[in-house]
Amino acid sequence: LIQERRSHEVNPAAHLTGANSSLTGSGGPLLWETQLGLAFLRGLSYHDGALVVTKAGYYYIYSKVQLGGVGCPLGLASTITHGLYKRTPRYPEELELLVSQQSPCGRATSSSRVWWDSSFLGGVVHLEAGEEVVVRVLDERLVRLRDGTRSYFGAFMV
Amino acid sequence: LIQERRSHEVNPAAHLTGANSSLTGSGGPLLWETQLGLAFLRGLSYHDGALVVTKAGYYYIYSKVQLGGVGCPLGLASTITHGLYKRTPRYPEELELLVSQQSPCGRATSSSRVWWDSSFLGGVVHLEAGEEVVVRVLDERLVRLRDGTRSYFGAFMV
Amino acid sequence: LIQERRSHEVNPAAHLTGANSSLTGSGGPLLWETQLGLAFLRGLSYHDGALVVTKAGYYYIYSKVQLGGVGCPLGLASTITHGLYKRTPRYPEELELLVSQQSPCGRATSSSRVWWDSSFLGGVVHLEAGEEVVVRVLDERLVRLRDGTRSYFGAFMV
C-alpha cells in the first residue's frame, strides 16, 4: 500500500461540526454540518453522517463529542461509547476503527448535579476510495450540542 | 480555499509547552514556551500566547491541559472550559474554534481528595496569514504545570 | 531543524493496536500489534513496544488508552499516568514527551461500581533517526484491552 502525495495535488481534509440536526434518535450515526461556519470538505465527500473517501490512502481521522447532563437519565447505562466506524464495499457491516468508553455520570455525586465531560478520538487508518467513516455515540442522549465547536468530526490524509 | 503543499517548502508546524509563566491570572490566554526543551516554531510565529499564521491554509491545531486539585476551590464553577480561539483582523472579538467543558472536581468525593484530569482538543481549521490562535482555560486555577509535557499547544499544516 | 517533505517519498506513518500481550506487568512499556487488523508500519520500525524512527523529522505522535475497573484495586494510587517517552542514543534515560495524569477511580462512588475512562495524548515532537518512542501507563492494571480499537499508539511525519 505504498502511497505518494504529489506536490501539485490538494491534500484531502475535512472538518464537520455538530448541529441541531446531529442527533437523530434513530439509532443511526451522528449527522454533521458540512459547509457553515468552521465546517468544510476538501477532497472528501459527505452523505448522511458519513465522510466518503474519494482517494485511497492513510488518513488521520478524529472526533470529539461534548457530553453533559444533570445526574443520569433513568435507565441510562453507566457507559457511554463514542466511536469511529468504517463502512466498506467488501463487508456488509460497520467495522470499529477507534472507540472510547467513559462513565461520565459517575462524576455527579447527587442526582441533581450538573456534569460535563468530553471524549476525543484520533488515529491513522487506511481508507480506500468508496469507503465511509461515521461517528456513533451510545447513548446519544448525553451529547450536548451548541455551536459546532464542542462536537465535531474530521479527517486529513497523512 | 484551494491550498497546495509544495515539495520544496517547509511545512508549517509548532509545539509550544507549558511553563511557570503560562498562567497569568489576568484573564488573558495562556502563555507558552517557544524554544526550550520540546518547544519549537517552524513556519509559524508567536506573540503573547498566540500562534501567528504566516502562510494561509488548513491547520490541525491541538492543545492539552493538565488539570488537578484537592477537592474544589471555594467558589469554583463546576465547569472547566478549555478552548482554542481565533483572533482575526476582520473581526474585533475572538472566535471559538474548538472547545471542551469538563467537571473534573466532581471526581473528588471528599473535599480533601486529590484528583487529576486532562483535556485534549484537536481539529482542522482554516487560518489566514496574520490570524492568531490562543488557548484559554476558565478557571485556570486548576491548570497544573510541571515540565512542559502535561500542558501544551501546537499546530501543523495538513 | 529545517525539514522538507519530498513529493516522491512515502510519508512515514504508523498505527499500532493494543493486544492481549500488550500488558507485561514487568514495568516495561506497553507492547503493540504491528500487522494484524488496523495496525501498520510505513517508513517506521518497531521493537519491543517502541516505534523506531528511520527518518529524522517532526512527527505528530499519539496514543489512547482505555481505562476501566470495578471500584479501585486495593493499594492503587489515585493517579494514573499515561505518557509517551523518547529513548535516544544520546542520553541513558527515557525522556518525557507528552504525559497525562487522571484519577478515574474517583468516578466510582461505591467500591462495586463499574467505571470507564479514556486518556488521549497527541503532539508534535522532533525525532532523529534511531530514536524510539514508547507508551507507558502507571498503573497498567487499569488498562482494558479488547480488540485494538480502544488502546493504540501511532505517529506520522508532519
Epitope: 500500500l1 505504498i2 502511497q3 505518494e4 504529489r6 495535488e9 465527500s45 452523505h47 448522511d48 458519513a50 466518503v52 474519494t54 482517494k55 485511497a56 490512502g57 463502512r87 464495499p89 467488501r90 456488509p92 480506500e128 476510495a129 468508496g130 465511509e132 | - | -
Partner: antibody, heavy 116, light 107 residues
Framework: QVQLVESGGGLVKPGGSLRLSCAAS????????MSWIRQAPGKGLEWVSY???????YYSESVKGRFTISRDNAKNSLYLQMNSLRAEDTAVYYC??????????WGQGTLVTVSS | DIQMTQSPSSLSASVGDRVTITCRAS??????LAWFQQKPGKAPKSLIY???SLQSGVPSKFSGSGSGTDFTLTISSLQPEDFATYFC?????????FGPGTKVDIK
C-alpha cells in the same frame, strides 16, 4: 451464482429519456455497492455512476445533472434514469457489483442509441 | 483525473506464447489496479484486482504485478480462448478510469 441482467435500452432521440434497469440475483443485493459503466461502440470503458450500501451516490462529470442512479433493495434492482440524452451517450451500458474491486461482476449490457 | 495508458495497443501472438501487457498510471495509485478481459460482443470479465490478486475462478496462467505507476499483466502460455482485448483500471482515486485496451490477436 451471481447474475446481473440489464434491460431498458433502445433507440431515443437527442434530448429524450430512458430508464435502465439491472436485475440482480444470486447474492444479497442490499449488502453491495453497485455501479453503471458504459462503452461507446468500438471505444473504451467509462465509469458512469455508483450507489453505495448507504445510498451515497457518485456521478462522472459527463453525466452529472442528467442521469440519476437509484436502487430498490426489496426488488433486488438497480436503475439508471437518463434524461437530456445526447449522441455521445450512445453506448452499451453495464451494471456491475463492487466487492473486492469496484467492477467484480458485470451484466451482459444493454445498448442505448441516441440518434435523430 | 488519473490517465491510464496501455502498451502495446495491439499485439499478435501464437498459442503457447508468453504475453506481457503493460499499464501506466499518470500518478501513483498504490496497488489499486484491476485487469479485465473482454471478448467481442461480451461484457468485460474481471481477472485481477489489487494489482496481483487473482479473481476467483480465473486460471493461474494470468498474473499481475506492479505498484505505484507501472503495472504488468502476464499470460504465461497463451491459449485460443485468451485472444481478446485486455483493459486495466485504477480505483485509487475518483473518478475510476480505464486504460484504452490492448487487443491480443492470433499471429
Amino acid at each position: 451464482q451471481v447474475q446481473l441482467v440489464e434491460s431498458g435500452g433502445g433507440l431515443v432521440k437527442p434530448g429524450g429519456s430512458l430508464r435502465l434497469s439491472c436485475a440482480a440475483s444470486g447474492f444479497t443485493f442490499s449488502d453491495y455497492y453497485m455501479s453503471w459503466i458504459r462503452q461507446a461502440p468500438g471505444k473504451g470503458l467509462e465509469w458512469v455512476s455508483y450507489i453505495s450500501r448507504s445510498s451515497f451516490i457518485y456521478y462522472s462529470e459527463s453525466v452529472k445533472g442528467r442521469f440519476t442512479i437509484s436502487r430498490d433493495n426489496a426488488k433486488n434492482s438497480l436503475y439508471l434514469q437518463m434524461n437530456s440524452l445526447r449522441a455521445e451517450d450512445t453506448a452499451v451500458y453495464y451494471c456491475a457489483r463492487w466487492e473486492l474491486s469496484p467492477f467484480d461482476y458485470w451484466g451482459q449490457g444493454t445498448l442505448v442509441t441516441v440518434s435523430s | 483525473d488519473i490517465q491510464m495508458t496501455q502498451s502495446p495497443s495491439s499485439l499478435s501472438a501464437s498459442v503457447g506464447d508468453r504475453v506481457t501487457i503493460t499499464c501506466r498510471a499518470s500518478q501513483g495509485i498504490s496497488n489499486y489496479l484491476a485487469w479485465f478481459q473482454q471478448k467481442p460482443g461480451k461484457a468485460p470479465k474481471s481477472l485481477i484486482y489489487a494489482a496481483s490478486s487473482l479473481q476467483s475462478g480465473v486460471p493461474s496462467k494470468f498474473s499481475g504485478s506492479g505498484s505505484g505507476t507501472d503495472f504488468t499483466l502476464t499470460i504465461s502460455s497463451l491459449q485460443p480462448e485468451d485472444f481478446a482485448t485486455y483493459f486495466c483500471q485504477q480505483y485509487n482515486t475518483y473518478p475510476f478510469t480505464f486504460g484504452p485496451g490492448t487487443k491480443v490477436d492470433i499471429k
